[in-house]
């Protein structure tokens, strides 16, 4: 009996035309939502003039439906048993699941000012930037609508730069009508234990953002894992959002709509400093902001973002060192709301429910040559927003799963 089930599972989780896995893999049957909470800055003037702590108040959720588009350019390679694809990006605003509209205004850090002053550290260039910042009446903070902040706006300061630069700025710009990839993953035909594991991303086995093992593309994309998952496993996956591979460990047994699943969570150790977790040494890319690699809980992904000083963390700086959150008032981290988890059906390896949570922050530093940053006395890793991307298997799919998979085993 068990052997027959194993054989059936092995057959059905292969990523090729005609299998259950393939159908759900090409276009997810699960509704996936991305909720955003924006950190609205309450005291912009005091910060700019006196280098005060930044007081933030989160506003949200603002919800978008995402991952509703089928994978594109799906191409099987029989020679190396891989399948390659592009994952198109799309986001549709869901007013009924949101606290307001895309036209809601927020006071946030001026993304262009913070980024330009970081990218161009030469004093002369900063003096040029300063004159353009002043001319465009830009400041350290700005008021932007949700739509502008997420999907892009024409920046008045960058529009004055007299040589070719991208003048449109947005945390997720460009997004709609773009695609992530090309991913090339093992289809599992020759070896089911490799199914969905990424072979290459954008044609490479490495990212070129990090040193040593940190640069590797490990595991799957977290939508599924090879079948017959054990609680003792460490599940590796790659997330292009955070420009790195990461891992999850077993936390608890969960019953999801009558289906027994394993809850795997991202442990605090994954965000630890190299002092506590030596494996993380290669995620520490500079010595000043990281206080000689002793800070933890924030990841500098500037190399992956054309030099823009983007730092990724968990929401509200969960699992981050006190020095990171010290200059920010109004944060309340808690595990239940702010950690990432994956609920995996162990027989198939399918992720039936997940909550991916992350926070986007921007570094802003004092600059003697940029007037609006002149009075800062310290560096700030400024939270801009946090997001919660969730998906849960639908009732119909759950019934089908129970009858065809778990029911047959039990």
């Amino acid at each position: 009996g068990d052997l027959l089930i194993q054989k059936t599972i092995k057959k059905q989780v292969v990523l090729e035309e005609g299998t259950i896995a393939f159908k759900n893999w090409v276009k997810t049957g699960t509704e996936v939502y991305r909720q955003f909470w924006i950190f609205d800055v309450q005291n912009p003037q005091e910060v700019m003039m006196n280098s005060s702590n930044i007081q933030v108040k989160q506003r949200g959720p603002y919800t978008y439906r995402v991952r509703f588009l089928a994978k594109e350019n799906v191409t099987q390679d029989a020679e190396d048993n891989t399948v390659s694809f592009l994952q198109p990006n799309g986001a549709i605003f869901e007013p009924s699941l949101s606290v307001g509209t895309e036209a809601d205004n927020f006071t946030v850090l001026n993304l262009a000012v913070a980024a330009a002053s970081h990218i161009y550290q030469n004093q002369f260039v900063q003096m040029i930037l300063n004159s353009l910042i002043n001319k465009s009446k830009s400041s350290m903070f700005q008021v932007r609508t949700l739509r502008e902040l997420l999907w892009g706006y024409r920046d008045p300061f960058l529009s004055l730069v007299p040589y070719p630069v991208t003048t449109t700025v947005g945390l997720f710009y460009p997004y709609n009508n773009t695609a992530d990839g090309v991913y090339k993953v093992f289809n599992g035909k020759d070896n089911i234990s490799k199914v969905a594991i990424i072979d290459t991303y954008k044609g490479k086995r490495n990212l070129s953002y990090w040193e040593s093992h940190c640069d590797m593309i490990n595991g799957t994309d977290a939508a599924s894992f090879p079948p017959f998952v054990e609680k003792s496993q460490v599940l590796q996956f790659f997330s292009s959002d955070i420009c790195r591979s990461i891992y999850a460990v077993f936390e608890s047994d969960v019953n999801l709509k009558g289906i027994p699943v394993y809850r795997f969570v991202l442990p605090s150790k994954a965000f630890a400093s190299p002092v506590e977790n030596p494996d993380n040494y290669c995620f520490c890319t500079e010595k000043i902001i990281s206080k000689n690699c002793t800070s933890y809980g924030v990841l500098d992904i500037s190399k992956c973002k054309e030099g823009r000083p983007v730092y990724i963390s968990l929401p509200h700086f969960l699992y981050a060192s006190p020095d990171v959150s010290e200059p920010i008032d109004g944060l309340n981290p808690n595990e239940e709301e702010h950690r990432t988890y994956l609920d995996i059906e162990p027989i198939t390896g399918f992720t039936l429910q997940f909550a991916k949570r992350l926070q986007v922050n921007l570094l802003v530093k004092p600059s003697e040559k940029i007037q609006v940053l002149k009075n800062l006395k310290r560096n700030y890793i400024v939270p801009i927003l946090w997001l919660n991307e969730t998906g849960t298997i639908g009732d119909e799919k759950a019934n089908m799963f129970r009858s065809q998979v778990t029911g047959k085993i039990n």
């Epitope: 161009y120 030469n122 002369f124 260039v125 003096m127 040029i128 004159s131 007299p162 040589y163 003697e368």
Partner: antibody, heavy 118, light 107 residues
């Protein structure tokens, strides 16, 4: 040792233009900005402007906007200043000067004498 | 524009004497000030940057001080090769501006 080699003296007619060069040696040309300074007995030293070859950024003294144009050729590590619609007022010694990571105007070229005369 | 007023415009001093030249800015320039020496027919030579930092290779008898609007260059013990014209420059904001110069001659 960093060196700045400027082009030779120029005798030019009023109304014409002149393009002076400053070749940079022994450092990474795109890292630091090059400034141009005009010197006359009447006005002393005057900053014309500067260019950062790495970013393409330029800054000008308003007094010289429309009069002087700064460019840089990364392939030959050479900075240029073009002075147009020349009058006797433009007769001067023109210096290029390099700013390094530590000091502004740390190195100077030998200067180019421009004489505007009929 | 920031105006740099240098004084004296010229001075005579003896060898071994302590010499001080001053430069006053029309506004606070945050110590973004350099000092240059120029000899006849030669290009300027940078001595001091950031108000008080000595450029490599410059003799230690030269020193700079000051903050805000007021700055000075001091030669602790004058030597023959120190004769020439001394200029200050502010690079706090555009346009960068030079002082009119101080001509130092042997008494």
């Amino acid at each position: 040792q960093v060196q700045l080699q400027q082009s030779g003296a120029e005798l030019v007619r009023p109304g014409a233009s002149v393009k002076l060069s400053c070749k940079a040696l022994n450092y990474t040309f795109t890292d630091y900005e090059m400034h141009w300074v005009k010197q006359t007995p009447v006005h002393g030293l005057e900053w014309i402007g500067g260019i950062h070859p790495g970013s393409g950024g330029t800054a000008y003294n308003q007094r010289f906007k429309g009069k002087a144009t700064l460019t840089a050729d990364k392939s030959s590590s050479t900075a240029y200043i073009e002075v147009s619609s020349l009058t006797s007022e433009d007769s001067a010694v023109y210096y290029c000067s390099l700013t390094t990571a530590s000091a502004w105007f740390a190195y100077w070229g030998q200067g180019t004498l421009v004489t505007v005369s009929v | 524009d920031i105006k740099m007023t240098q004084s004296p415009s010229s001075m005579y001093a003896s060898l071994g004497e302590r010499v001080t030249i001053t430069c006053k800015a029309s506004q606070d320039i945050n110590s973004y000030l350099s000092w240059f020496q120029q000899k006849p027919g030669k290009s300027p030579k940078t001595l001091i940057y950031r108000a008080n930092r000595l450029l490599d290779g410059v003799p230690s008898r030269f020193s700079g001080s000051g903050s805000g609007q007021d700055y000075s260059l001091t030669i602790s013990s004058l030597e023959y090769e120190d004769m020439g014209i001394y200029y200050c420059l502010q690079y706090d904001e555009f346009p960068l501006t030079f002082g009119a110069g101080t001509k130092l001659e042997l008494k």
